[in-house]
Amino acid sequence: SAPGEDEECGRVRDFVAKLANNTHQHVFDDLRGSVSLSWVGDSTGVILVLTTFHVPLVIMTFGQSKLYRSEDYGKNFKDITDLINNTFIRTEFGMAIGPENSGKVVLTAEVSGGSRGGRIFRSSDFAKNFVQTDLPFHPLTQMMYSPQNSDYLLALSTENGLWVSKNFGGKWEEIHKAVCLAKWGSDNTIFFTTYANGSCKADLGALELWRTSDLGKSFKTIGVKIYSFGLGGRFLFASVMADKDTTRRIHVSTDQGDTWSMAQLPSVGQEQFYSILAANDDMVFMHVDEPGDTGFGTIFTSDDRGIVYSKSLDRHLYTTTGGETDFTNVTSLRGVYITSVLSEDNSIQTMITFDQGGRWTHLRKPENSECDAAAKNKNECSLHIHASYSISQKLNVPMAPLSEPNAVGIVIAHGSVGDAISVMVPDVYISDDGGYSWTKMLEGPHYYTILDSGGIIVAIEHSSRPINVIKFSTDEGQCWQTYTFTRDPIYFTGLASEPGARSMNISIWGFTESFLTSQWVSYTIDFKDILERNCEEKDYTIWLAHSTDPEDYEDGCILGYKEQFLRLRKSSVCQNGRDYVVTKQPSICLCSLEDFLCDFGYYRPENDSKCVEQPELKGHDLEFCLYGREEHLTTNGYRKIPGDKCQGGVNPVREVKDLKKKCTSNFLSPEKQNSKSN
């Protein structure tokens, strides 16, 4: 069973009085419609809350918005609707908050039918003041900030025009027409696709990919026959239609589209899709959909060039284009990802990788849990995690898995213990070592959040009834204490804490219902008095990540290096603080064959770590061979795994082979054979 709330858990004495003094209620004096909340800047304490209420009338919908601002992490709110002239704000565009600590906010207003363009309200002082600006177009998308310069904005219009502003939305210029999709790249570069004939939909697969590096003064066409494109890490990907049929292939560029290489991935047909699951500056996880409406595909991991791919995981659950996948980057430990596979019997199972997709395994059964009744073997089963797919299926799962980079090793998720994911009511599980071991943390579904870089975990039970109790733990979920934050229970709608998990404030949102009205209400609880003192050196202990066998000389080595972390002791009740920085010490490991992937034209036989030359090239390997760049066909068979930092040890040096001679086949016409380099 999960940890109780017995005497042993009474770590924090007199907490009721401490929390009561730091609980702040705010009732919003408008009707309950929808509410959206945004944090403005980092560590500023500024929150914007937009409430909207729709009244469907016979001819049209009457809408009313209210805008509230807090500058103390939600303890107090001020109605600032007058700053936006009581205008109705379009919630589908949300509040466009500027990057980093720019203090910039853009709200898109609803305008009456006949107007020439839309209207925005702009603030560059953390929403203290707003400037109304009428647009020369009707926006189709939210304003997008350049990551490098928050004064540069781009937006698409309902007429498919690409509009750019260089002065934070004061003046706008249409830099291109017939645009389908636009994205900021690095260095204020804009990538976008255009159609020539009918429309984005009609020209799908015949789009052109363009680039401008000077905000629309000049352009370069960097791709044709484009189906779609995406950016991931330092890679630019485009799916390109094949010459001969309706299939398409991934091409990749690492120089902003100046030069392209064909990725050694299977081509896909019309009903299939590619999806970038995760990407960093080293590599990319790519999902390739299976033919037919199977609901699964294959995960491939790339080399450092984004060109050569290793099969990482079969039968990866991913429902239709833009559908649901459980793929989750565990941000609290390097190299760890969790996802789901669809078994042959159509059950869904959770898999985890600790080495960036090199190997996948089931999650270890929590020590304090039993296998469910459906498990074939009551002693041998696994933990299965509920993520996006379960949520989309309306299972009783209020939240996806949670991890934070500054709460090292902590992963919290809903799950079930058995042979596969269960549709029964899940419990909440926690791992303190990045997913290697798990413990049942709370019975039944809960909302949860991490505060003070892991120093506090807060949870609220998921219930259809009104609630007035919050649970908190100061020891990474081992023991829990409960606090009644209001006498009058509320219908709970969400927990809100500042992104980054550094705050010690949590806001509980909900509404109260009386006979005639219902009102939004928030309770903000500051845990600063629970963690009375600042943590000192003695409050931390040293932890080796990825440790599985201390007797192994290379224990903890993942991607060529091991990392030791200073972690808060579970018994220490103290503040990490807002300025807390994770202290870690890396040490380089000796290389082994595990630190290398097989280059193009080579493969690893089952249970062998050596890369062996493929006797013949078939399918997409042969296509890559024919249309790939010449320099990618010269190899010694091994390539260091992206991001691997190992040194010394095994160095798989062998003669460099030119695979071009393999790029011939009886099935290909002579003219095809002549065009093997591009």
């Epitope: 042993e8 040293i542 932890w543 080796l544 201390p550 000389y553 030791q564 579970k570």
Partner: antibody, heavy 124, light 106 residues
């Protein structure tokens, strides 16, 4: 089988320093923390501090902070404990001990292998 | 630092007796407690780690229990080899030992 062999007995004058060594054999020295524990005649055990050979991360008990230095040499699988400004109360048997480890935490599982002890006598 | 209080400080018992030694922590230490046996002129020997896990090679008559602040070491049937001094040690703060319990022949 892992063994910890300590250097021989020492007689020191008050105000001087002593450096005791602890050589490991038969195991993966680098992957375990080494703690130093002392025991004054007829008294209980007292933890002084510890070190993790990989990276050389040391930590010390408050009482000894500033007076003790613990180091490790991975190449020779040897840990060292140096205690300075010696006084007569520092007369004790000094033990090195390996911290057992089942997970990534270095200090949580007890000390499973001990050295034979080094007697340090501080006398004028 | 976390203080460890061991009781009793001395315990007289006979062979075959069931012996219980208690250790109390000044604050919760979860299960991060170890028990050692020490004989005169010898280094301590680990008996129990993580409050209740028996170290390999230690006879099963030794057992540990407890979590949080209260812990016990039990010797189910005292043997002649068991007369020694026993120490508890917490590992969740900077390591500290209890004062020791001497088990002597009645």
């Amino acid at each position: 089988q892992v063994q910890l062999v300590q250097s021989g007995a020492e007689v020191k004058k008050p105000g001087s320093s002593v450096k005791v060594s602890c050589k490991a054999s038969g195991g993966t020295f680098r992957n375990y923390a080494i703690s130093w524990v002392r025991q004054a005649p007829g008294q209980g055990l007292e933890w002084m501090g510890g070190i993790i050979p990989i990276g050389g991360w040391a930590n010390y008990a408050q009482k000894f902070q500033g007076r003790v230095t613990i180091t490790a040499d991975e190449s020779t699988s040897t840990a060292y404990m140096e205690l300075s400004s010696l006084r007569s109360e520092d007369t004790a048997v000094y033990y090195c001990a390996r911290q057992g480890r089942k997970t990534g935490y270095y200090y949580y599982y007890g000390m499973d292998v001990w050295g034979q002890g080094t007697t340090v006598t501080v006398s004028s | 630092d976390i203080q460890m209080t061991q009781s009793p400080s001395t315990l007289s018992a006979s062979v075959g007796d069931r012996v219980t030694i208690t250790c109390r922590a000044s604050q919760s230490i979860s299960s991060w407690l170890a028990w050692y046996q020490q004989k005169p002129g010898k280094a301590p020997k680990l008996l129990i780690y993580k409050a209740s896990s028996l170290e390999s090679g230690v006879p099963s008559r030794f057992s540990g229990s407890g979590s949080g602040t209260e812990f016990t070491l039990t010797i189910s049937s005292l043997q002649p080899d068991d007369f020694a001094t026993y120490y508890c040690q917490q590992a969740d703060g900077h390591i500290t030992f209890g004062g020791g319990t001497k088990v002597e022949i009645k």
